[in-house]
């Protein structure tokens, strides 16, 4: 008799990552009967919503539904119709919305309210939209990468099925860089976490984890740039800002009102004798690096050791996965290879920043000029943050792995968020049972 294929017994889940600069929709899929196994959930689609982050719609909230349509429609196409009603949809908003909430809780609530109403119109099982905390963002990022790397599996393997995998069950630390915040999360080595706010306890698959995490609001790459500009314009003698973080020959006019729009620049705010100023790039890595370091207050630390701004940071331990903008920026700069030393990265950044703007524009014609102009700053910022902010060294640099995807799934907080909300990470190790009846044909 001919074997007839049984209908695939699978489940789907959707998570929207509403970041400060854009929104991405992720569709996940897993075998229904293996929900509690580690490593079975994988991403089948990412749809990047065209346009800015949801916080930019604060003055036109009625258009949020239009903005989300294409990606939600894409989800309807990808997920079989029979599964629509049981597919959960979650939206998590991160630091862009945290900043909006700091400015106005009412406006942030209004944005989320319209998001919820828009997403409720689709045939899925909408589970809510909320602003996740920085601590959650760090924790879920850590869960995601370790889940995908197979670190929670108790079965020891003699072969490696994923990149970066060592046979030990040592978890990877997680380094996440967004537009408005950055997170560092890892298991310290037998070190007490001196500040309770930075301590997380998990029991996953029968094992306890004491995890350190911190989210630095305003230290994502976009908000760090606004901070730097606000700091530097304070000491400019006129409305020209000669900026080492932009390529020689680059020019851009900035409105002072835009500069002071974000809560991240409040500490640098002052009355300026002009409404606009012009950035003129001079393309000098060393000077750019020095300017960025002034954003990190390292003069005060109430703990045994700190990252910056008085925030406790235990000694770094083990390997780290650096993802999101850490990866995108370094990928653009062609610096993600495991073989590239920190000294080499610095050298390459010096050369890149010194390249004339006209030359850069010609070399990267397909890249939006706004993004293209900021890679010198972003690359320099990443080095400054990792080396001076988090205290990586030339030696420990080799423990940083710039990761975009693991096993086809994007590294980021969304998978961990969904695994948690769908109760797919058991506290105890599931008992290994014989084949279920559904396996027999």
């Amino acid at each position: 008799t001919q074997n007839k294929a049984l209908p695939e017994n699978v489940k789907y889940g959707i998570v929207l990552d509403a970041g400060s600069s854009h929104t991405s929709l992720y569709i996940y899929k897993w075998p229904a009967e293996k929900e509690n196994d580690t490593g079975v959930v994988h991403q089948v689609e990412e749809c990047r919503v065209k346009g800015p982050g949801i916080s930019k719609f604060v003055q036109k909230v009625n258009e949020i539904g239009i903005y989300l349509t294409d990606c939600m429609e894409r989800a309807r196409e990808v997920i079989p119709r029979s599964q629509h009603q049981e597919t959960p949809v979650y939206l998590g908003a991160t630091a862009g919305m945290r900043l909006l909430r700091m400015e106005s809780e009412e406006l942030a609530d209004r944005v989320l309210d319209v998001v919820e109403r828009s997403l409720s119109n689709y045939p899925f099982d909408f589970q809510g939209a909320r602003i996740i905390t920085g601590q959650e963002e760090g924790a879920y990022g850590w869960i995601t990468i370790n889940y995908l790397l197979g670190k929670f599996s108790q079965k020891t393997r003699w072969f490696s099925i994923v990149p970066y995998e060592t046979n030990n069950q040592e978890t990877f630390g997680a380094l996440d860089l967004g537009g408005a915040s950055t997170q560092v999360t890892f298991v310290p080595q037998n070190q007490t976490i001196e500040s309770p706010d930075n301590a997380l306890q998990f029991r996953l698959y029968g094992k306890d984890y004491n995890v350190y995490t911190h989210s630095f609001l305003c230290y994502g790459k976009d908000q760090a740039l606004w901070q730097k500009l606000a700091k530097d314009i304070q000491v400019a003698s006129n409305e020209i800002l000669r900026d080492p973080c932009f390529h020689p020959g680059y020019k851009k006019v900035v409105n002072v009102s835009d500069l002071y729009k974000t809560p991240c620049t409040k500490r640098f705010e002052m009355t300026l004798p002009f409404q606009q100023f012009e950035i003129q790039g001079i393309g000098n890595y060393q000077q750019c690096h020095q300017s960025i370091l002034e954003l990190f207050n390292t003069s005060y630390c109430p703990y045994s050791q700190c990252a910056f701004n008085g925030i406790f940071l235990p000694p770094l331990q083990g390997d780290f996965g650096a993802f999101s903008a850490f990866y995108f920026v370094m990928k653009f700069l062609n610096l993600t290879s495991e073989k590239v030393s920190q000294e080499k990265v610095t050298e390459m950044m010096k050369k890149f920043c010194a390249q004339p703007w006209e030359e850069i524009k010609t070399s990267y014609a397909g890249v939006k000029e706004k993004y293209l102009s900021e890679y010198c700053f972003s690359g320099t910022y990443i080095l400054s943050l990792l080396l001076q902010g988090y205290h990586f060294t030339a030696d420990s640099w080799e423990h940083i792995h710039f990761i975009g995807k693991i096993q086809g799934s994007d590294a980021g907080w969304t998978l961990g968020y969904m695994l948690n909300l769908t109760n797919m990470i058991p506290a105890e190790q599931p008992l290994s049972t014989p084949l279920s009846h559904s396996t027999y044909v």
Partner: antibody
Framework: QVQLLQSGAEVKKPGATVKISCKVS????????VHWVRQPPEQGLEWIGK????????KFDPKFQGRLTITADTSKNTAYLELSSLRSEDTAVYYC??????????????WGQGTLLTVSS | DIVLTQSPATLALSVGQRATLSCRAS??????????MNWFQQKPGQPPRLLIY???NQGSGIPARFSGSGSGTDFTLTINPLESEDFAVYYC?????????FGPGTKLEIK
Amino acid sequence: QVQLLQSGAEVKKPGATVKISCKVSGFSIKDTYVHWVRQPPEQGLEWIGKIDPANVNTKFDPKFQGRLTITADTSKNTAYLELSSLRSEDTAVYYCALYGYDDDAYYFDYWGQGTLLTVSS
Amino acid sequence: DIVLTQSPATLALSVGQRATLSCRASESVDNYGISFMNWFQQKPGQPPRLLIYAASNQGSGIPARFSGSGSGTDFTLTINPLESEDFAVYYCQQSKEVPYTFGPGTKLEIK
């Protein structure tokens, strides 16, 4: 500023294939959709199809099924429309267009200057 | 396919007057709480220009005298007051489902 520069006018024989390009400057095509619209002489507008250059998903009018290919080369920031088995009724001005939200949540639209395709024996 | 009908085919008005252009769809173009109806203006020898998207939202840089309304199957583009540069052909387009269809157009001419 954003500019869409289309390739020049084409004269083709029935049954031939044409490939029209749309080169975008000042904006990354990955950040929006590229639409193709045509307009026969002295007639109205007709939507042909669109592409999402970020993932090459395309949607188009089924009446072009088997004859139409819409592609994009993000490294060149250029979109392409290829139409085969040409017939006289394909004679039209072909436009590429971008529309969607920009970084400040303003809804923009940008159009190419148009490419006149004449199909004649 | 969704068929769009525009009326009138031609409209002759003077500068300063109000123009009301209508577009009717063969079936509802509403979905997910949104009306997927757009309006374009086209002048001779030029590409079209987006005026209104999602029934009532103004495109970037479009003057406030252009407004859109309607839902379901019946939509209206209003231009008030008319200015000399507004005399052109106006098309409605639905983007609810593929193929995104255009109406046949309304020609707005000077009286």
